[in-house]
Every structure is written in C-alpha cells, then in structure tokens.
C-alpha cells in the first residue's frame, strides 16, 4: 500500500497527516491567588496550576505568567469553567432597602492576546447576574468554542471578581485547550 | 506519494498516524433511573442508556453498569449535562420562617476510577446552590474538558440526587467522551 | 517509509487518514436578529454571523439561512452558548400579587434536520426557570456535545425567546461545529 | 478528602536508620508533591526535602547524605528514611503536601495538608 | 538559606485581645510568606499564605500584612481556642525555613 492509498481525494500536501498525540494541549487547573491591583474597567486575569494534579501542558503548549502559549497555528477548542461563591448579594440588600435593584453579576472572559494588535480580543463570555435569596450562593458558569488561533497568540482568563472565586478544589475551576 | 511525505517534520513513528473514524467515542443520555441505596457522604451514579436513540458507543468504547470503559490510553474530552429540576428549595421556606438560611444545592461530579488506585478521582464538578423564589425550578449543569486517561478506567457521572434529576428527554441529561 | 508504517495495525482501508485541517468547521456568532413569525409551539430559530469578526467557515462546512449544512457524514461536536437578559420575570411579579407561582423560562435547543426525515431531531437542550429578584437579569445557557451525522443534515438553533437573546456581543451568543 | 497517614513512633539506637512512611489519599503521589518536615522537642520546624510528583527528590543540605525520599506508587505511599541517627535527631517527623499559590508574578509553596506526626527518639 | 526572626518568642494575653506576631525575612521574600497554627501534640494547620490571604475556613479575626522582609500576623478579638504556638514559614525557595515559633498563652 502507498500512503496515497489512505489519503482521501481532497487531500492537499499542503496539510499534511500528523499523529493526534503530538498536538498542543493543556488542561489548567485553580490555584491560589492572592488579589492584585487592575485597572477600575479591567477584569483580572487567572494564574492556573499547570502540572501538579490533574493539570498538564504537553507538545509545545506552554503556561507562564497566567497565559497559555499557543505554539502552532490551527483551530483550537478552547474551555474553562470557573465557580463562583458568595455571600449574598447587595442586590437583595438594597432591595430590602428599597433602593434601586440593580443585580450584582459575575463574568467570565477568555481572551486572546497577539503580540502585533494591540488590543485583547474577547473569544467568549460568560455573564450571570447574581441577586441571591440565599445567605451563601455558588455557581459556576462554563465556556468552550473553536477558534482559529495563530502561532504566538497568547491565552488568558479574566473574571469579575477574583475574591469570589473558589479555588478550593481542581475540579471546580478550570482551564484548557486543544489543536484539533 | 510516499506517506512519509505526508508526515510533518516532526512526526514520530512511534505515535502512529490513525483514522479519526476509528477512535473511542460515546454519547449516552439519561434514563429513569431505579432509586439506589448509597452512602451518606457519597454521591449516587446514575445510569445511562448506550444505543437506543442518539446514544451510541462506537471503536471499544463500552458502556456497562454506570460506567464507561476506556479501551485505549490517550487524551478524552469529556462532557456532560444534567438538567435538574425540583419544587421550591427549603432554602426559601427556611428563610420565610427565619430560621438560618442555608441554601441547598445541586452538584454533578464526573468521576474517574482506576482499578489500580485505591480511590475515585474527580475529574469535573459543577456545583451550584438553589435557593429559588419559584414554586418549581429547573436548570442544567454543564461540564467538559479533556483529561489524559489510561486504557481500563471507569467514568461514571455523580449526582447529589438522583431523585431530582430530569428523565424525560434524551436532550436534556447526557454523558459523553472521545478520544482526540 | 511506507505509509503502511505508519497505520496502527486496526487501521481499515475503508477509513483513510486524512488531515485534520481539512475537515469541515464552523463558529458561528450571534447578530441582530429579526423578529420573525413562528407557529406557537415552535421556537423560532436564530439567524448567525458566518465570515465577520471571530466567526467562520471551512471546509466545505456552509452556513445558509439560520443552518448549518453538514458537507461530511461523521461524528461532529457541537456547541452552542445563548445568553439570555430581561426585566424581572413575570414570576416574581406573578408571586407579589398572591397568583399562582408559576416561573418563566428560557430555553435553547439545538436541533437536527434531515431531509429525508419529517420531524426535526432535539440534540440538545438547556433549560432554565427564571424566577429573579432583581429588576435586571442576565444570564448564559451553554450546550455541547458529539453526534453522528450525515452529509446534508443541517443544524440549527432555536430559543424559547429571540427577544431576550443578547445580541450586543459575539463572545456572549454563538454556535459552532466540527467534525472529529 | 485529602488525608496523609504515618507510620507509628519508633525507638532506635544511635548509629541506626529510621524509615517512615506516609500512606495518602484523596490525591495520587505521582501528581502532588510530598515533603517532610521535622519537629524536634518544643522547637520550630525543619523542611527535610521533598519528594517530587515526577519522582525525582530535593533535601534540605543539612541532611544531605543521610537522608533518603522513596515512594511505592501502587499503594500511595511515600518513605522517608534517615541513616546514622543521633539524639538530635529525636523529634516528631511530618510528611506534608504542599500547595502553590501566586503573588504577583511569582509563586511560592506552603503546605495545606499534614500528617499526624511520626515521633522517633533516638536513646542509646 | 533565607533566615526568618519571629517576634516575640511568647506572649501572654485575653480572651477578646489583640494580638500581633512578626516575622522578618533575611532577604525579600516578594509576600511568599505563609502562617501557621499548631496546638500540643498536633499538626501545624495553614492559616494565611501569600502574607495576606485567609487559607479557605479559617475565621476572618486572623489577618496577615507586610511586604518585602517584614511581616505580620494579627489576631482581632482573641478566642479560647486561638491559645497555640504560631509560626511563619517563607515559600520563596528550598528549604523553606520557618521561623522559630510564638507560644501564645492565657494571661
């Protein structure tokens, strides 16, 4: 058999055959943080925990400094989840005082960083209003798409609030990304 | 053409090219579940169908008994919904008596068992406080994310309570994994 | 090197290799939407961009008139994030003059149809009581998962409400696929 | 939850090895580091060294040599083990998984979980 | 090594006192620092990390400040169960020093 013979029709030498298990990858996972100073309209971004339990960074997809470094160009499924916890909300605080209602929220952002545009790109949002009855709430609010991603874009996660985030166990808050 | 010529420069022959169509996938979806006796701390697995429907398991992934077989090492990505649905928590009636207002909560857990470890892993959890105004709520919970698996672990999906999660569409609870 | 040596040794002849950037793909993002007449009982389908800003589409993966045209039979990962914003639900409302307590909903489907089928198949479906306190709410349902498709199936998106969809930005509403 | 069990006290002559184990669950060795820190009678702490996720090992200087980090990976456990004892040595051993947080840019590691404590006195 | 001074040795106080315990650092230590809780005959128990930051559970009358070589360890409103021996431990490198301990004790 010649290696033509597995190749279907439309295959183009242009994109050649490559084995799966050499493709980017990394599954990030909460650590703690201790808060940081960011500008007044700017969502802070997440450090991740990039080797120890369930966390892992292989085949040129490296983390440093709260960001995963995209080292080929291709379509990447890009997911994070992040869980929230709370007391509650001034929402129902100032309802009961009868003041305006105006929902406290929580959002999360992935966001692309390139080198040669000078702003961030916002890939995906998550957005929850959160005006509790509860005295303690948590939730989490889950993101994942394909993009088309560039060698040397840079990958980041920013939230609302980081007090609020719950950085207690692995499986809560997340972070990945994968060439398909 | 050479296969070779197909390979990029470095593709390894000891990660072989393979056929995407051949790989280990599922797609379960829920079915009414038979009430099981479980340990107070533990969560209850819930049962899934694996063929009628848009189930399906496909290339030596097997379904058996709550859980999913993997038949093959490598890097999953793994998913799950599980919607949920209940009359008004306690939460809001504890809080109309002026009891301690704890809210009550619903939790989804994708577990990981390995024969030759002595305990189950959390891979995913989603966990989310209710505490609904309502009379009846419903709401899903969403995971996903890939994980580097051995051939012969178990996944299974835990629940807080089997007794409020929704049957009645194929659409609405499902359990998933596939190799990249 | 043949590219025999390359194939594990389960590789069929009737699966050939082909390149991963070949295979069809689309992320589509929210716009605008129209309002448009649908029957009762029938939640009306979102309209997506399909070439501007994050959104695209490749490889024979074509976008036409709220669907996705499926190019490929094979198994596909789908996804969909739909975020939701109103006023105070009539719930709340409903609650405050002492009626029936009967809470709102918001509701995505992602919905197979093949032409050779009468009825559109529900993949998928995120639900979601909205009983909010608050005068503003907000808030995403996400979905994703794998099914096996056939060349010329299409896929669409429908919604309980297109007038609570949040249509202001492409990283808060979108729906995409590819083929594994 | 995450739980690190040791081994009971031991009684040893001067001149003699001491090995300690630390039985873990709720997390895998070979994904979490586990060091060990020591405790003489009413004094502060001393880090010993520590066992790395991957397997390879760091000890504080001062035991060089007579200090040695094994783990059994099919039963969760990691082994402390200290040669040539003398009295100083008595003191209350703790295995410990540790944690990383970040300040900053920079992270740092501190330690969540502990052992109860493994005490060996060393009495000739 | 990087030496760490705790301050004072021991200290004698009331219940609803407040209390603080100092740490300093032989050289910068960038806030790696973490605080400690151990009680006779048990296990240190983590109490703040990153200087300043509550480990998860621990009540909020515990508070820590400082940065570069100096830090330190307040307690609010002193509670009976807060009697016990603190210590602080820098994260930066190996070997991870701790300071030499605080006992606490009932005046």
């Known amino acids: 058999l010649k290696g033509q013979e597995f190749a279907p029709s439309h295959q183009q030498v242009y994109a050649p055959l490559r084995a799966d298990g050499d493709k980017p990858r990394a599954h990030l996972t909460v650590v703690r943080q201790t808060p940081t100073q960011h500008f007044k309209n700017q969502f802070p971004a997440l450090h991740w925990e990039h080797e120890l339990g369930l966390a892992f960074t292989k085949n040129r997809m490296n983390y440093t400094n709260k960001f995963l470094l995209i080292p080929e160009s291709g379509d990447y499924f890009i997911y994070s989840q992040v869980t929230f916890r709370g007391m509650t909300s001034e929402c129902s605080e100032i309802r009961q005082a009868g003041r305006p209602n105006k929902p406290d929220s929580i959002t999360v952002v992935i966001t692309k960083v390139t080198d040669s545009y000078p702003e961030p790109t916002q890939l995906l949002m998550g957005t929850k209003s959160v005006c509790e009855v509860g005295s303690n709430w948590f939730q989490p609010i889950y993101l994942g798409a394909m993009f088309s991603l560039q060698e040397g874009d840079k990958l980041m996660v920013n939230v609302s609030d980081i007090s609020l985030v719950d950085y207690t166990k692995e499986d809560k808050t997340f972070f990945g990304a994968f060439l398909l | 053409l050479k296969g070779q010529e197909f390979a990029p420069s470095h593709q390894q022959v000891y990660a072989p090219l393979r056929a995407d169509g051949d790989k280990p996938r599922a797609h379960l979806t829920v079915v009414r579940q038979t009430p099981t006796q479980h340990f107070k701390n533990q969560f209850p697995a819930l049962h899934w169908e694996h063929e009628l429907g848009l189930a399906f398991t496909k290339n030596r992934m097997n379904y058996t008994n709550k859980f999913l077989l993997i038949p093959e090492s490598g890097d999953y990505f793994i998913y799950s919904q599980v919607t949920f649905r209940g009359m008004t928590s306690e939460c809001s009636e504890i809080r109309q008596a002026g009891r301690p207002n704890k809210p009550d909560s619903i939790t989804v857990v994708i577990t990981k068992v390995t024969d030759s470890y002595p305990e189950p892993t959390q891979l995913l959890m989603g966990t989310k406080s209710v505490c609904e105004v309502g009379s009846n709520w419903f709401q899903p919970i969403y995971l996903g994310a890939m994980f580097s698996l051995q051939e012969g672990d178990k996944l299974m999906v835990n629940v807080s309570d089997i007794s409020l999660v929704d049957y009645t569409k194929e659409d609405k609870t499902f359990f998933g994994a596939f190799l990249l | 090197l043949k590219g025999q040596e390359f194939a594990p040794s389960h590789q069929q002849v009737y699966a050939p290799l082909r390149a991963d950037g070949d295979k069809p793909r689309a992320h589509l993002t929210v716009v605008r939407q129209t309002p448009t007449q649908h029957f009762k009982n029938q939640f009306p389908a979102l309209h997506w961009e399909h070439e501007l800003g994050l959104a695209f589409t490749k490889n024979r993966m074509n976008y036409t008139n709220k669907f996705l045209l499926i190019p490929e039979s094979g198994d596909y990962f789908i996804y969909s994030q739909v975020t939701f914003r109103g006023m105070t639900s009539e719930c709340s409302e409903i609650r405050q003059a002492g009626r029936p307590n009967k809470p709102d909903s918001i509701t995505v489907v992602i919905t197979k149809v093949t032409d050779s089928y009468p009825e559109p198949t529900q993949l998928l479906m995120g639900t979601k009581s909205v009983c909010e306190v608050g005068s503003n709410w907000f808030q995403p349902i996400y979905l994703g998962a794998m099914f096996s498709l056939q060349e010329g199936d299409k896929l669409m998106v429908n919604v309980s409400d297109i007038s609570l969809v949040d249509y202001t930005k492409e990283d808060k509403t979108f729906f995409g696929a590819f083929l594994l | 939850q995450v739980q690190l069990v040791q081994s009971g006290a031991e009684v040893k002559k001067p001149g003699a090895s001491v090995k300690v184990s630390c039985k873990v669950s709720g997390f895998s060795v070979t994904s979490y580091n586990v060091h060990w820190v020591r405790q003489a009678p009413g004094q502060g702490l001393e880090w010993m060294g520590v066992m790395w996720s991957g397997g390879n090992t760091d000890y504080n200087s001062k035991f060089q040599g007579r200090v040695t980090m094994t783990r059994d990976t099919s039963t969760n456990t990691v082994y402390m083990e200290l040669s040539s004892l003398r009295s100083e040595d008595t003191a209350v051993y703790y295995c410990?998984?540790?944690?990383?947080?970040?300040?900053?840019?920079?992270?740092?590691?501190?330690?969540?979980?502990w052992g109860q404590g493994t005490l060996v006195t060393v009495s000739s | 090594d990087i030496q760490m001074t705790q301050s004072p040795s021991s200290v004698s106080a009331s219940v609803g006192d407040r209390v603080t315990i100092t740490c300093r650092a032989s050289e910068d230590i960038y806030s790696g620092l973490a605080w400690y809780q151990q009680k006779p005959g048990k296990s240190p128990k983590l109490l703040i990390y990153?200087?300043?930051s509550l480990q998860d559970g621990v009540p909020s009358r515990f508070s820590g400040s400082g940065s570069g070589t100096d830090y330190t360890l307040t307690i609010s409103s002193l509670q009976p169960e807060d009697f016990a021996t603190y210590f602080c431990?820098?994260?930066?490198?190996?070997?991870?020093?701790f300071g030499a301990g605080t006992k606490l004790e009932i005046k």
């Open positions: 990153g200087a300043s």
């Open positions: 410990a998984r540790a944690g990383r947080y970040y300040h900053d840019s920079n992270y740092y590691w501190d330690f969540p979980y």
């Open positions: 431990q820098e994260g930066l490198k190996s070997p991870y020093t």
